[in-house]
Interface confidence: low
């Protein structure tokens, strides 16, 4: 289903994963960031939209067109895109076009995800970014350099903000011991807009008290804590924003009324069973990997919807019944 987002002069269509996201620009100067450098001898300008929006996993086009005073310049040129800040930010893309050539040969494309769509000979440095991630949410700056008979260069000062949206993804769900011999649960999710988190479980309604954690890197992380798990059973964390929802669960089982010895035996038995299972899995994998040359095609990323993590934890304490979280 197509979602259209107007961003001033920039209209971006966000399509299902794998499709292009096209950005159409209205070149009316008052709607764009138009940066002009003029003197009696020359006039440079760059036109970029203030913002482009696209969904994680999709592609986006960062538009950038320019004008320059060297009317028929046909010499060598270099097109550059930086991230973060103008002039000093790290380059994410660079290409060079030979004299008379309309094709810019790529010299740098960070992670192979950046491709020049525009033709620098036609004053277009528009860049396509593939497989967007939340970490790509930053400001980008285009730059062009002439290096033939004419030596000149110009770089966008304001840049274009790439706003990456993402459906929620639960990145961590865990159960930790509390000081009072109880247990607490933590759920951390990322998404943009930042998702709302809710806990549900035995003797709980929906606990919506989510605490936003500080941004780590460029992730949009939110954490919700369930301070006291008072009943055995399944506890589910749900993360939701305007783009979707994701769920993950932990299971809490405590051993009640058993002697210390039988509790230890139960736990050791469970651990032994799991160790055997693990050995079986490893043996099966080893058997499958026996051929020396095995082609392993790239696997597409898993869908984030309904992704579940199961926490396994046991606490040994003579004054408190032990607990374990087991996979179903």
């Amino acid at each position: 289903m197509e979602k259209s987002i107007w961003l001033l002069a920039c209209l971006a269509w966000v399509l299902p994963t794998g499709s292009f996201v096209r950005t159409k620009i209205d070149t009316t100067e008052n709607l764009l960031n138009t940066e002009v450098h003029s003197s009696p001898a020359q006039r440079w300008s760059m036109q970029v939209p203030p913002e482009v929006s696209a969904e994680a996993g999709d592609a986006a086009v960062l538009p950038c067109t320019f004008t320059h005073p060297h009317r028929h310049y046909d010499g060598p040129l270099t097109a550059i895109w930086r991230a973060g800040e103008p002039y000093a930010g790290p380059q994410v893309f660079r290409c060079a076009a030979a004299r008379g050539s309309e094709l810019c040969q790529t010299a740098l494309s960070l992670h192979g995800r950046f491709r020049l769509l525009g033709n620098p000979r036609r004053n277009d440095l528009s860049l396509r970014v593939e497989r967007l991630a939340l970490a790509d949410d930053r400001r980008y700056f285009c730059r062009v350099e002439f290096a033939g008979d004419v030596h000149d260069r110009y770089e966008s000062r304001h840049g274009v903000r790439l706003h990456v949206t993402a459906a929620p993804r639960i990145v961590n769900i865990s159960v930790l011991p509390s000081p009072a011999h109880a247990f607490r649960a933590l759920c951390t999710a990322e998404g943009e807009p930042p998702p709302a988190l809710a806990w549900s479980g035995p003797a709980l309604g929906n606990s919506l008290a989510a605490v936003r954690s500080p941004r780590e890197g460029h992730g949009h992380l939110v954490t919700a804590e369930l301070p006291a798990l008072t009943h055995d059973g399944r506890y589910t964390c749900t993360a939701a924003n305007s783009l979707g929802r994701s769920e993950a669960s932990v299971y809490l089982f405590r051993f009640h009324g058993a002697s210390g010895a039988s509790t230890v035996a139960l736990l050791l038995g469970a651990l032994g069973f799991k160790a055997l299972l693990l050995l079986g899995v490893l043996a099966a994998r080893a058997a499958r990997r026996r051929p020396e040359h095995l082609d392993t095609p790239d696997t597409p990323p898993r869908s984030q919807a309904q992704e579940s993590n199961y926490e396994n934890l046991s606490q040994m304490n003579p004054r408190s019944p032990p607990a374990t979280m087991c996979s179903p």
Partner: antibody, heavy 122, light 111 residues
Framework: QVQLVQSGGGLVQPGRSLRLSCAAS????????MHWVRQAPGKGLEWVSG????????GYADSVKGRFTISRDNAKNSLYLQMNSLRAEDTALYYC???????????????WGQGTMVTVSS | QSALTQPASVSGSPGQSITLSCTGT?????????VSWYQQHPGTAPKLMIY???NRPSGVSDRFSGSKSGNTASLTISGLQAEDEADYYC???????????FGTGTKVTVL
């Protein structure tokens, strides 16, 4: 199923006009550049014209410039070639082809139509 | 603009490897890594076999491989099979207008 279905060819007198159509299905038409390539009987392939995904950039072979017009209707998933002032040397099998990228001036054509014959003769 | 130069015909026996050449100039093949190869059986539309010098589209046999040296691009067909008998055309992006140039074509015959 990804396919391009062509129509509109035929016999036409020199100086007259003809319009070729190409209906696309099975892929997101407005993500890609589209092209016309022709092949004269017993000859090789010749690129005729290309159009970017949003019609913002268009190119023609020198031999057809000023006489042929390429266009597309993304809402109808269709590509067109309006051929005016036809000449005997325009006689060929005309193919529509899908580009790999949104810009027409990138090079590879990964999906081809079945071809439609245009014969210019008096 | 001149077409890229290809040998008129190349032949080989089943199981053999053959190499088709495509010679251009420093304005096309020599300048850019945008060379494509197409296979055309009689009476059918061309099929993309290689793009950007050496990339194979999905569905194309790995017996087909592409390379480039200087102003000459090459298509190698290994383990030649009867169904490989067809016409082969190379194409390149070029800095001239129009931006595409095709080769003259090579007829491959499987003996």
């Amino acid at each position: 199923q990804v396919q391009l279905v062509q129509s509109g060819g035929g016999l036409v007198q020199p100086g007259r006009s003809l319009r070729l159509s190409c209906a696309a299905s099975g892929f997101t038409f407005d993500d890609y550049a589209m092209h016309w390539v022709r092949q004269a009987p017993g000859k090789g392939l010749e690129w005729v014209s290309g159009i970017s995904w949003n019609s913002g950039s268009i190119g023609y072979a020198d031999s057809v410039k000023g006489r042929f017009t390429i266009s597309r209707d993304n809402a109808k998933n269709s590509l067109y070639l309006q051929m005016n002032s036809l000449r005997a040397e325009d006689t060929a099998l005309y193919y529509c082809a899908k580009g790999l990228w949104p810009s027409y001036d990138l090079d590879a054509f990964d999906i081809w139509g079945q071809g439609t014959m245009v014969t210019v003769s008096s | 603009q001149s077409a890229l130069t290809q040998p008129a015909s190349v032949s080989g026996s089943p199981g053999q490897s053959i190499t088709l050449s495509c010679t251009g100039t420093s304005s096309d093949v020599g300048a850019y890594n945008f060379v494509s190869w197409y296979q055309q059986h009689p009476g059918t539309a061309p099929k993309l076999m290689i793009y950007e010098v050496s990339n194979r589209p999905s569905g194309v046999s790995d017996r087909f491989s592409g390379s480039k040296s200087g102003n000459t691009a090459s298509l190698t067909i290994s383990g030649l099979q009867a169904e490989d008998e067809a016409d082969y055309y190379c194409s390149s992006y070029t800095s001239t207008i129009p931006p595409f140039v095709f080769g003259t074509g090579t007829k491959v015959t499987v003996l």
